[in-house]
Amino acid sequence: FNMDTRKPRVIPGSRTAFFGYTVQQHDISGNKWLVVGAPLETNGYQKTGDVYKCPVIHGNCTKLNLGRVTLSNVSERKDNMRLGLSLATNPKDNSFLACSPLWSHECGSSYYTTGMCSRVNSNFRFSKTVAPALQRCQTYMDIVIVLDGSNSIYPWVEVQHFLINILKKFYIGPGQIQVGVVQYGEDVVHEFHLNDYRSVKDVVEAASHIEQRGGTETRTAFGIEFARSEAFQKGGRKGAKKVMIVITDGESHDSPDLEKVIQQSERDNVTRYAVAVLGYYNRRGINPETFLNEIKYIASDPDDKHFFNVTDEAALKDIVDALGDRIFSLEGTNKNETSFGLEMSQTGFSSHVVEDGVLLGAVGAYDWNGAVLKETSAGKVIPLRESYLKEFPEELKNHGAYLGYTVTSVVSSRQGRVYVAGAPRFNHTGKVILFTMHNNRSLTIHQAMRGQQIGSYFGSEITSVDIDGDGVTDVLLVGAPMYFNEGRERGKVYVYELRQNLFVYNGTLKDSHSYQNARFGSSIASVRDLNQDSYNDVVVGAPLEDNHAGAIYIFHGFRGSILKTPKQRITASELATGLQYFGCSIHGQLDLNEDGLIDLAVGALGNAVILWSRPVVQINASLHFEPS
C-alpha cells in the first residue's frame, strides 16, 4: 500500500553467517541503527555467531564482537552457539538482548547446552551476561591429594605414575575440578595449590616433577589437617565440593589426633578417599590389620566407596579407574541421569522483554519439552517441570514439545500482563499457552490453543498486537508456517481476538495463491501504524515464497481487529536481485529517516533490508451542485 519498493536500503552481509536472520531497529539518542543477528558468524576459529550494528542511511555495518564475551569460571564451548538467533529490544532504555541458545559448557564428560544471552546497553556496549539455566557443574570440585612421602614409600616413581594417571582422569578447568597436592612425612608441604594450574596438561606437568621428600615418621593426621585447614583455603572455591585423597603406606605416628582431624573434616564436608599401600607390610611380612583399620577410619563412610588398598606401590595403577569412577559418581548423586532438567535447555532460543525483566524460551529444558524462564534484576524464576503438567501431560513427555520456541506477552484489562509461549511440536500439532509465572516456581496456565495439523509447527511464531494503542492487547496472531495445503508448505497465521479474558479464534490471515512452498507465518511482526490511520499494523513473512526469494505481507489494523486481507505484498524480487529468504525476520517500531513515518526492517539470507514508508494522502472528495 504505502511501503516504497523502489528505493529500499539493502544492507549486505555474509550469507554464510546468515546475516539478517534477526533484525531490530535501534535508537540511540536520535541516531537510528539496525541491529542485525548473524548466528553463523565466525570469530577466529569458532563459528560463534555475532551481532552487527548498521547505520540506517549509509555506511558499513560494524560487528559488535559479542562472540568474544566469555563467562568466567566455566569451561565454555562457544563454537556453534548461534549468537544472534534471538534479539529482543527493551524500548525503555534502548538496551537489547542477544542470545546464544546453543552456548554450552563442559561438565565432566558432557557438554551442557544451557544457552546464554548478552545484554547490550543503548550505546552498543556489552553490560551483562544473562544465563538463568546455567548451573554449577557436578564436577565443581576442589580435590586435594595428600601424599605420604615418608622413607618407607618405595619406589616413588610408582606413586608418581599413579598421581599422573589419576590426574588425567580429572576434568580440570574453570567451573570444574581444581587439584592441589600436599606431601607429608614428618612435615607437610604444598606441592602446588588448588588454583595454581587450570588444565590437565599443566597439572600433570607439575605432578611429574614432585620428588619424594622422605621422613622417618608418617604424620597422616597432620597431613589431613594441613590439607583441610590450609590446602582447601588457598585457592579453594566457595560452594565447590571438597574431596581429599589420602595415599599412605603405614600407620600414622600421630593417630591419636585422627579423631579430631576427621571430625573437623566432616564438619567442613570434606569427602575423603583413602588408599592403603601395603608394600611395606608385605615386604616385611607384617600383619596390616591395624593399618587397614586406620585407613578405613580416615576414609569417609561407607568404606566400600571410599577405601582402597593395594598390595604395593606398583599396584596403584590398578585402582586409577575405580577411584576416578567413585569420585565422579558424586556427580550423579540423587539424580536420575536419564532425565535432563536445564542441562540442555538452549535458553534464549527466543526472548521477550517485559516490564520487570526478560522472558527466555528454553526449548531443550525438561527433555526438550521446553520451558520459559524469567530473569529479573531480583533474580531468576525457573518454573518446575511439574508446573507445565496441566497442558503438557506426563504421557507426552518424550515427544519434545519445544515449549519456548517463541515467547511474547499480552495485556488484558483484567489480568494485566500474561505471558505467551509456543510449543510447536506438542503432540505433533503444536500448542500455545497463556500463563503467569510465580516466584515459587509455579505457573498458572490461563488458556491453551492447539494446532490443527500434524507438523504444521503451530506456535513457532506468536505476536500480540495492540491495534488501537490503548495498552491492552487486541489480537494474538499464531503462526503455523509449515501448514501443508494444496501440496505445499504454505503456512498459516491464526487470528485470536481478546474477548473479556479469553482469546477467541477468529479466522486466519490470507496469503497469496502461489503453488510453491511459502512458509507464510515464519515471522510475524506487530508494527506501529504504517498507513497513518492511527491503527497499528502487522507484517507477516513468507521467506520461501517465489522459490525461496521470500515475500512479506502487510495487514492493516482496524477498530480493535486486523483486516485479514493483505494491503500490500512485497516480494524480494521487486526490491533487489539475489535476495533470499526475505521476510525471515521483521521489525517496525521506529521512524528511521526522520520523515515522521514508521519504516520497516526485514531480514534476508545475508542481507538486511530497510523499506521506507511513504505518506498517505487522503483525498476527501465532496461534490457540490450548482445550482443546488
Epitope: E186, E217, R219, A221, F222, E225, E251, S252, H253, D254, S255, P256, D257, L258, E259, K260, I262, T290, N293, E294, Y297
Partner: antibody
Framework: EVQLVESGGGLVQPGGSLRLSCAAS????????IHWVRQAPGKGLEWVAS????????YYADSVKGRFTISADTSKNTAYLQMNSLRAEDTAVYYC?????????????WGQGTLVTVSS | DIQMTQSPSSLSASVGDRVTITCRAS??????VAWYQQKPGKAPKLLIY???DLYSGVPSRFSGSRSGTDFTLTISSLQPEDFATYYC???????????FGQGTKVEIK
C-alpha cells in the same frame, strides 16, 4: 637416656591455682604425646589430660574439664598442667608420662611424680 | 566412654604361683591395651603393650592375651619382686583419651 621430671607441686588452698611442669630429656617432645595421670592417696591411677605437642590437640577427663589446662613448649621440651579452682579431691600425686607410636600407644616412660595437696 | 573393669581387686599368692588378672572392656575395643606394675611410692612401669607384646626389659614370665573384650595379664611364676599393684589401661582408638582399670593388688600369701 629418657627422663621426665615433674615439678611445681605443693600445698594450696581450695579455689587456688598451681602450675605443674614436666621437663623431658632424652627425646623430642615434638614427636610424642604427654599425659598427666594422678593417684590420690591409697587409690588407683586416674587419667587427667593429654596433649599432642605437635598439633596442640588436647583431651581432658570430665573431672577436670574447664579447670585444668594442658600445654607444651617444644622449645623448652616441657609440658605443663595449669590447675585452677582446685578442690580437696584434686589432692594426689601427679605423674607425667610419654605416649607415642613406638610403644604402640602405651605410657612407656613416667616421671617420679609431684604431690599436690589441696587443703585449707 | 569405655570402662575397664579389672578383677580381682586384690589377690594373695605365693612365690612360684601362676597369677592371672583380667580386665573386661565395656564395649569392643582395639588391641591398644597395656599393663603396668606399680610399687608403693613409685611411678608405674610398663609391662605389656598392644595387649600381648612384652615391653623391653620386662621378664618373660609376664604375658598378655586377649579374648574378645577380655584382656588378661598372666605371671607364670610369681617372684618376690612381683608383689605390687597392677593396672590395665585402654587407649581409645584415634584419640589420646585413656582409661585405667581399678587396679589389682598382688600380696604375699
Amino acid at each position: 637416656e629418657v627422663q621426665l621430671v615433674e615439678s611445681g607441686g605443693g600445698l594450696v588452698q581450695p579455689g587456688g591455682s598451681l602450675r605443674l611442669s614436666c621437663a623431658a630429656s632424652g627425646f623430642n617432645l615434638y614427636s610424642s604425646y604427654i599425659h598427666w595421670v594422678r593417684q590420690a592417696p591409697g587409690k588407683g591411677l586416674e587419667w587427667v589430660a593429654s596433649i599432642s605437642s605437635y598439633s596442640s590437640y588436647t583431651y581432658y577427663a570430665d573431672s577436670v574439664k574447664g579447670r585444668f589446662t594442658i600445654s607444651a613448649d617444644t622449645s623448652k621440651n616441657t609440658a605443663y598442667l595449669q590447675m585452677n579452682s582446685l578442690r580437696a579431691e584434686d589432692t594426689a600425686v601427679y605423674y607425667c608420662a610419654r605416649y607415642w607410636y613406638y610403644s604402640a600407644w602405651a605410657l612407656d616412660y613416667w616421671g617420679q611424680g609431684t604431690l599436690v595437696t589441696v587443703s585449707s | 566412654d569405655i570402662q575397664m573393669t579389672q578383677s580381682p581387686s586384690s589377690l594373695s599368692a605365693s612365690v612360684g604361683d601362676r597369677v592371672t588378672i583380667t580386665c573386661r572392656a565395656s564395649q569392643s575395643v582395639s588391641s591398644a591395651v597395656a599393663w603396668y606394675q606399680q610399687k608403693p611410692g613409685k611411678a608405674p612401669k610398663l609391662l605389656i603393650y598392644s595387649a600381648s607384646d612384652l615391653y623391653s626389659g620386662v621378664p618373660s614370665r609376664f604375658s598378655g592375651s586377649r579374648s574378645g573384650t577380655d584382656f588378661t595379664l598372666t605371671i607364670s611364676s610369681l617372684q618376690p619382686e612381683d608383689f605390687a599393684t597392677y593396672y590395665c589401661q585402654q587407649s581409645a582408638p584415634y584419640s589420646s583419651l585413656i582409661t585405667f582399670g581399678q587396679g589389682t593388688k598382688v600380696e604375699i600369701k
